[in-house]
Amino acid sequence: MRRGPRSLRGRDAPAPTPCVPAECFDLLVRHCVACGLLRTPRPKPAGASSPAPRTALQPQESVGAGAGEAALPLPGLL
């Protein structure tokens, strides 16, 4: 299977995930990674050319730098 298994969501069920089990979607790099590798935003050095970190309420355009949001752990459903 390409994706983690899905089921109808009950009130307490986890959200569907694009990742296989043991992987989580990393909002910084925008793809699934091993859950232990989730990244968190770091302070940028002065003069860095990448955009300032975004929040969910302030999306910005980017040409390549990481998105800057905190990683959201959504492991594949077991």
């Epitope: 994706r3 694009p18 925008r30 390549g64 990481g66 959504l74």
Partner: antibody
């Protein structure tokens, strides 16, 4: 079933703006971690990545083309748009959109061909 | 940008033959690589994601592997429908970048 279909003008003159539409079905761009991207391929050449838009409206562009590119979406109508300003003959290519979910693009459209000619 | 160097650029092989294509990443991409197949009509299909995971519906004669910064796509026994163009794509960082492609032709 996930499907994507690109549409565009077919032919443009230099300096005009290219407007492409990706119409999709089988998924929603309101879903967490869902995205749509664009690539292109000049005839007989390789693939070039252009732009990407995500469910949360975060956008990424190819740095070499960023000043000319604008990507946007209409979530309710299941469409993503790519505009390329000031086209030249070098923009003659087949343009593809694709769905991204978890591990980059997993489904691609059939492509739409653009010819830029004076 | 991460450069993906793909080899060979073209390859002639016979039905039933085993072939391997390689992409080398200029920077660490940690296995975040897909292999794509493009048929002569332009149709693009993902075969492998995360360097080695086969997409659903893709024949098991296709496999992906990694050795350091080198990523390989192997077709264990070529079938007529496998003659096409193949591309690697890194998704470790933006901008996404493709290998230059391999044209697989019938000998």
């Amino acid at each position: 079933q996930v499907t994507l279909k690109e549409s565009g003008p077919g032919i443009l003159q230099p300096s005009q703006t290219l407007s492409l539409t990706c119409s999709f079905s089988g998924f929603s761009l309101s879903t967490f971690a869902m995205g749509v991207g664009w690539i292109r391929q000049p005839s007989g050449k390789g693939l070039e990545w252009l732009a990407h838009i995500w469910w949360d409206d975060v956008k990424y562009y190819n740095p070499a083309l960023k000043s000319r590119l604008t990507i946007s979406k209409d979530t309710s109508n299941h469409q993503v748009f790519l505009n390329i300003a000031n086209v030249d003959t070098a923009d003659t290519a087949t343009y593809y959109c694709g769905r991204t979910y978890g591990y980059d693009v997993d489904y691609w459209g059939q492509g739409t061909t653009l010819t830029v000619s004076s | 940008d991460i450069q993906m160097t793909q080899s060979p650029s073209s390859l002639s092989a016979s039905l039933g033959e085993r072939v391997s294509l390689t992409c080398r990443a200029s920077q660490e991409i940690s296995g975040y690589l897909n292999w794509l197949q493009q048929k002569p009509d332009g149709t693009i299909k993902r075969l492998i994601y995360a360097a080695s995971t086969l997409d659903s519906g893709v024949p098991k004669r296709f496999s992906g592997s990694r050795s350091g910064s080198d990523y390989s796509l192997t077709i264990s026994s070529l079938q007529s429908e496998d003659f096409a163009d193949y591309y690697c794509l890194q998704y470790a960082s933006y901008p996404r970048t493709f290998g230059g492609g391999t044209k697989l032709e019938i000998k």
